[in-house]
């Protein structure tokens, strides 16, 4: 018996089509994914194949205005369109708060969206029962599936659950979900879920009867053969884990951003094992039209969009320097107002302990595009913070040794005056350089923001502890020649939209103004 | 649990046709095929042919003539219909599933006067 | 058809031993190779499915490899249990089995 999974993750309310690097579509020819390209190729495989699933291993929400704008209301309408049989919670679904999921999202979907590790307690036990289940058995043809969710437990740290919601180990909480389906004569078992290719190797490995595993969050690319596109494969199509029980898993996940389908036929012998299993992700290129009616529904839903990129967000009564005469080469405000929102995007106080689990930031002065001049009003807009981050890139969480961190900061300024983007903006971090010195040994103090205190102070970098930092995306995959950060980088886990950060930040402060305060010297 | 339950005569004349009945439990044959294979006394295993989930079957060349699978999926069987047998066909007939994973406990059929 | 060349036919060993037992197809069967296990009161058994997977219950003592042609049958420390005659078994076009190999007490 033969099941197709069709199957997407970490799309990150990539709604409607971008270009290839995910960012906003500019030549339409050349662009790529969106729910409307999806549902054709969906269609056309569920038309040529008798047993097809369409699953989403998490993290729908967060991403682009699309998002800021409908907070999860898009997700569960244009996933109903879709017709998907399934998903798993991801971290960013919770990026609003257990209200922002529940309302939008798990009380207007109309397929089952899981997670065994979450438990919820105190009163959100019964207002969110039933909304989101361990399991689902889902008939396919005259055969019956089991599809178990799991999410990332360090969802604590990175989106906002509350404190009614308990993240369990997720090799635990499987184990026993997956023998009471095995009880229900439910042979054949997906482990659905967003803790990253690691632990979805793990869950392959050990929970007893999963048979397949589809995965996210770390945006894992996977191909057979040659790659249609600019990812790099981090090994095959379907990567085969041999389990504690000498059974072969196929652990799958499709890149991110709905630029692929990920692909995957399974084979079932009768008592439910895997005989075979094959695939590759599908590019969603140009190729493939985009479907009339979801494309109408799509620029229906666009017209509120619009509107919102000229709304107040709120004011600023400083000039926000973000002029490449200024972040590429000193401390400058719209660096601090950035590095700042990014912080205070992350504060999560989930430990008497720490004051926060993160204290620092860093912001390559190159990403930062434009000024904002105060002088219109102090009037702060989307459309006026797009232009200073323009690129759709995240604020992520790392976790770096002090060793590395000293390493980017000499990066910082190895060719210092030449008006180049690796020149670093800071929050939590106070940094002194020496020019006169030779490139590789200018940083003559580097203090760090304490995050285990009460009380915030600095403190020298301390080589061989490992830090939390809040970075953008693009220096933590190594870009402006930050190879240290992704070649020793601990732990990365993707944040939220970079714009939504700084917009959030805005509107909760209504009134800004930012100083230069001797965090660079 | 899957199972597969064989039912049929164990002695058989010269010239007459085995019927053996094969009964599937814990899978559905609209999901599944079943095959069949012998094994004569003291030799390795045959196969005789398979009944596929659609309906259809295949047949080993050598018995093609007198071979006979069909299934009524509503009863959850498979017969074997073998007709014209010889003492030579003096086996242990199984039944199995499609991949091989469960098998039916074995007929021993005698063919003989 | 697939032939299925299955060697050796039989082989005596002690309990401790490590028991191993080929096969090899006439063609790439893509490993699509089962190992079966019948005791002497006729019963069969799958032991190992897609070439290398095992089947549920089967102790880990038993492992299976290969690809292509050459299909391998590995019991890393023979139990009395096990004394039983092994067959492999390709489904990559219809069924064709090996010849057996029976395990005997040394």
């Known amino acids: 018996w033969e099941l197709t999974i069709l199957h997407t993750n970490d799309v990150h309310s990539r709604l409607e089509q971008t270009s290839e690097d995910s960012s906003k579509c500019v030549n339409a020819s050349r662009c790529m994914g969106g729910v409307a390209r999806l549902f054709t190729k969906v269609q056309q495989i569920r038309r040529a194949e008798p047993n097809v699933l369409l699953l989403d291993a998490g993290d729908q929400y967060q991403g682009t205005i699309w998002f800021t704008v409908y907070k999860g209301a898009e997700v569960a309408h244009f996933m109903n369109a879709l017709r998907y049989d399934a998903m798993a919670l991801g971290n960013h679904e919770f990026d609003n708060g257990v209200e922002g999921l529940i309302e939008p999202l798990l009380k207007e979907a109309k397929f089952p969206i899981l997670s065994a590790n979450i438990k919820a307690k105190g009163p959100l036990a019964s207002q969110i029962s039933g909304l989101y289940l361990p399991y689902k058995v889902l008939p396919v043809g005259d055969e019956v599936v089991g599809i178990v969710g799991y999410t990332s437990k360090e969802t604590p740290f990175l989106s906002n659950p509350g404190t009614n919601l308990v993240f369990e180990d997720e090799i635990t909480a499987l184990q026993p979900e997956v023998d009471k389906l095995k009880t229900l004569n439910v042979n054949k078992i997906i482990a659905l879920g967003h803790s990253g290719f690691e632990m979805d190797k793990l869950i392959a490995q050990k929970v007893r009867g999963v048979d397949v595993v589809v995965g996210g969050h770390s945006n894992t690319f996977l191909y057979t053969g040659n790659p249609p596109s600019k990812e790099v494969p981090a090994g095959k199509y379907p990567f085969i884990v041999t389990s504690d029980d000498g059974r072969k898993v196929p652990v799958v996940q499709a890149y991110a951003f709905g630029k692929y389908l990920g692909y995957l036929k399974i084979e079932f012998d009768e008592r439910g094992n895997v005989i075979s299993s094959h695939g590759n992700p599908i590019l969603l290129n140009s190729s493939i039209p985009e479907d009339p009616s979801i494309k109408a529904d799509i620029n229906k839903w666009r017209i509120k969009l619009d509107n919102y990129s000229t709304q107040e967000l709120g004011k600023t009564i400083v000039y926000l320097d973000g002029s490449s005469q200024s972040c590429r080469f000193r401390e400058c405000n719209m660096g601090n107002l950035i590095c700042d929102a990014m912080i205070n995007n992350n504060l999560r106080h989930t430990d008497e302990m720490f004051w926060n689990h993160v204290s620092m930031c860093i912001l390559n002065g190159g990403g930062i595009r434009s000024p904002i001049d105060e002088r219109n009003n102090g009037t702060i807009t989307w459309e006026n913070l797009a232009a200073v981050l323009p690129f759709g890139g995240t604020f992520d969480l790392v976790q770096l040794k002090g060793s590395t961190l000293k390493k980017a900061f000499e990066h910082s300024v190895h060719r210092y005056g030449q008006s180049t983007g690796e020149f670093l903006q800071v929050g939590g971090i106070h940094v002194v350089y020496d020019l006169s010195r030779k490139p590789g040994d200018r940083v003559v103090k580097l203090d760090v923001l304490c995050t285990k205190c009460r009380v915030p102070s600095y403190d020298p970098l301390k080589m061989d502890e490992v830090y939390k930092v809040i970075l953008p995306n693009f220096l933590a995959n190594g870009g402006d020649g930050f190879q240290m950060i992704k070649d020793e980088l601990l732990r990365h886990d993707s944040g939220d939209q970079d714009i939504n950060v700084v917009s959030t930040y805005i509107s909760k402060m209504k009134v800004i103004y930012p100083a230069v305060e001797g965090r660079i010297k | 649990e899957v199972t597969l339950k064989q039912s049929g005569p164990g002695l058989v004349k010269p010239t007459e046709t085995l019927t053996l009945t094969c009964t599937v439990s814990?899978?559905?044959?609209?999901?599944?095929?079943i095959q069949w294979v012998r094994q004569p006394p003291g030799k390795g295993l045959e196969w005789l042919g398979v009944?596929?989930?659609?309906?259809?079957?295949d047949y080993n060349a050598a018995f093609i003539s007198r071979l006979t699978i069909s299934k009524d999926t509503s009863k959850s069987q498979v017969v074997l219909t073998m007709t014209n047998m010889d003492p030579v066909d003096t086996a242990t007939y199984y039944c199995a599933g499609q991949y091989g994973s469960v098998w039916g406990q074995g007929t021993l059929v005698t063919v003989s006067s | 058809d697939i032939q299925m060349t299955q060697s050796p036919s039989s082989l005596s060993a002690s309990v401790g031993d490590r028991v191993t037992i080929t096969c090899r197809a006439s063609q790439d069967i893509g490993d699509r190779l089962n190992w079966l296990q019948q005791k002497p009161g006729g019963a069969i058994k799958r032991l190992i499915y897609a070439t290398s997977s095992l089947d549920s219950g089967v102790p880990s003592r038993f492992s299976g490899s290969g690809s292509g042609t050459e299909y391998t049958l590995t019991i890393s420390s023979l139990q009395p249990e096990d004394f039983a005659t092994y067959y492999c078994?390709?489904?990559?076009?219809?069924?064709?089995f090996g010849g057996g190999t029976k395990v005997e007490i040394k």
């Open positions: 078994l390709q489904y990559a076009g219809s069924w064709t």
């Open positions: 009944i596929w989930s659609g309906g259809s079957a």
């Open positions: 814990g899978f559905s044959l609209s999901s599944y095929g």
